[in-house]
């Protein structure tokens, strides 16, 4: 997988004056990495491994490109001739990454009350708009506004992708990322189905880095992909990520599954528990995390694209 | 433990300028945080007058503008309240306070009177 | 600027009783909103933020509660230490402005 650095900004709006602040979360390959604190007027790591990154280092360049950044998305939002009473909200997304054969790609996205109406590939230069009349009516007047704007020219948008490559590049210098591994605890449980079957679920969590085989196998062979139903690999707030894997089988037959979770080069089997047992839980040296992650979203009552 | 203390004349002649000192106990006003004044007028009605942030960028109340400046001196970390031209409705009790959005630290407050 | 318009200046409870003090804005304001109590002689001290969060040390029958343009500060089980004046303060967009004030006495 690529590395990839995720700045989402939001400004909101009340019948067309818009709010002297922002929101804005940025993720680090996939993770919650830094938040704008409002109330302390600055960036902030996102928990304990985030501070690790950049280690004594201070967060004053990145709070410098948020409040820019945020300072750029209220000009935009105060320049949307359609706004209706109301509340309203203008997201940007702007992802950088760096791809194993150091190729890189970088691109824009901008979303009004949760709805995409204009994205940029940076590198090709080239804009794109969804059919809807909506989205073609915000895209042309945001377009029109960032021309009218000396700053958004075609090297603005260079200068940003560079700016952005160059943080990631020096996040991913830190062995934090690079050579970071936490492994993950595995949880199998089972519960009934229907009559003579039972559902098994294999839970992976607290894990990093994102890459993890979890599968169910049968007598040590691995179950086809269609007789499985997979989870997402999600963060969990904690700078790890989780996932899941399910199976249906025969009550009577459970000694014959196991669960097989391959991450980081080691693997490990984990047997359905027997008879009443419900949970059967796999300490792998499972490294605890405290550092929850505090949503600023979660008051917002705004779409939030992820 | 987080201070705040404020200092000043007490007493200042209409037209003069106002000065008022904030002192800083516990904490750094250049680590993070914005450093705030804000009046209470003789009715209790309370005013924010604006903010000095840790970075030292300001933010004023539209009202006050043109009269207001803060500045700071981070070697003895204090922050400054400079309004010029008063007039007696500046007469109130003046409180530096710490925060970007809501105040979670205040000083006792120091009563201002703008009298001939 | 926003208003923040507390209605009720004076309200007179029973020791032990239920409170409820109203803030209205002038518009949404997204539930950046802050409750502060003031004591005779003192500065003002932040009892709640983000219009429901409860501050460090503040007793929990203290609470907030609201959204969009009206929010409201409860006290269960008022105490003689709650009598003061209370304000509400919103940082939707500066200029922050504060309401009235209610000032709170025992029956």
């Known amino acids: 997988e690529p590395h990839s650095l995720r700045y989402n900004l939001t400004v909101l709006s009340w019948d067309g004056s818009v709010q002297s602040g922002f929101l804005a979360e940025v993720h680090l390959d996939g993770q919650p990495f830094l938040r704008y604190d409002r109330q302390k007027c600055r960036a902030k790591p996102q928990g304990q491994w985030a501070e690790d990154v950049l280690g004594n280092k201070t967060w004053d360049r990145e709070t410098r490109d948020l409040t820019g950044n945020g300072k750029d998305l209220r000009m935009t939002l105060a320049h949307i001739k359609d706004q209706k009473e109301g509340l309203h909200s203008l997201q940007e997304i702007r992802v950088c990454e760096i791809h194993e054969d150091n190729s890189t790609r970088s691109s824009q996205h901008f979303y009004y009350d949760g709805e995409l109406f204009l994205s940029q590939n940076v590198e090709t230069e080239e804009w794109t708009v969804p059919q809807s009349s909506r989205a073609q009516t915000l895209a042309m007047n945001v377009r029109n506004f960032l021309k009218e704007d000396a700053m958004k020219t075609k090297t603005h948008y260079h200068a940003m992708h560079a700016d952005c490559l160059q943080e990631l590049r020096r996040y991913l210098e830190s062995s934090v990322v690079l050579r970071r591994r936490v492994p993950p605890m595995v949880n199998v449980t089972r519960s009934e189905a229907s009559e003579g079957n039972i559902t098994v679920t294999c839970r992976a969590s607290s894990f990093y880095p994102r890459n993890i085989t979890l599968t169910w196998r049968q007598d040590g062979v691995s179950l086809s992909h269609d007789t499985q139903q997979w989870g997402d690999v999600l963060p969990d707030g904690n700078g790890t990520y989780q996932t899941w894997v399910a199976t249906r089988i025969c009550q009577g037959e459970e000694q014959r599954f196991t669960c097989y979770m391959e991450h980081s080069g080691n693997h490990s089997t984990h047997p359905v528990p027997s008879g009443k047992v419900l949970v059967l839980q796999s300490h792998w040296q499972h490294h605890h995390h405290h550092h929850g992650l505090n949503d600023i979203f979660e008051a917002q009552k705004i779409e939030w694209h992820e | 433990e987080v201070q705040l203390e404020e200092s000043g004349p007490g007493l200042v002649k209409p037209s003069q300028s106002l000065s008022l000192t904030c002192t800083v106990t516990?904490?750094?006003?250049?680590?993070?945080?914005?450093w705030n004044w804000i009046r209470q007028f003789p009715g209790n009605k309370l005013e924010w007058m604006g903010y000095?942030?840790?970075?030292?960028?300001?933010n004023y109340n539209p009202s006050l503008k043109s009269r207001i400046s803060i500045t700071r001196d981070t070697s003895k970390n204090q922050f400054f309240l400079q309004l010029n031209s008063v007039i007696t409705e500046d007469t109130a009790t003046y409180y530096c306070?710490?925060?970007?959005?809501?105040?979670?630290?205040w000083g006792q407050g120091t009563t201002l009177t703008v009298s001939s | 600027d926003i208003v923040l318009t507390q209605t009720t200046s004076y309200l007179s409870v029973s020791l032990g009783g239920r409170v409820t003090i109203a803030c209205k804005a002038s518009?949404?304001?997204?539930?950046?909103l802050a409750w502060y109590q003031q004591k005779p002689g003192n500065a003002p001290r932040l009892l709640i933020s983000?219009?429901?969060s409860l501050e460090t040390g503040v007793p929990s029958r203290f609470s907030g509660s609201g959204s969009g343009k009206d929010y409201t500060l409860s006290i269960t089980s008022l105490q003689t230490e709650d009598v003061a004046t209370y304000y509400c303060?919103?940082?939707?967009?500066?200029?922050?402005?504060f309401g009235g004030g209610t000032k709170l006495e025992i029956k």
């Open positions: 518009a949404h304001i997204n539930n950046w």
């Open positions: 983000d219009a429901t």
């Open positions: 303060q919103h940082y939707w967009s500066t200029p922050w402005t």
């Open positions: 000095i942030s840790y970075s030292g960028s300001t």
């Open positions: 306070a710490r925060g970007g959005t809501y105040f979670d630290y």
């Open positions: 516990g904490y750094s006003i250049t680590s993070d945080y914005a």
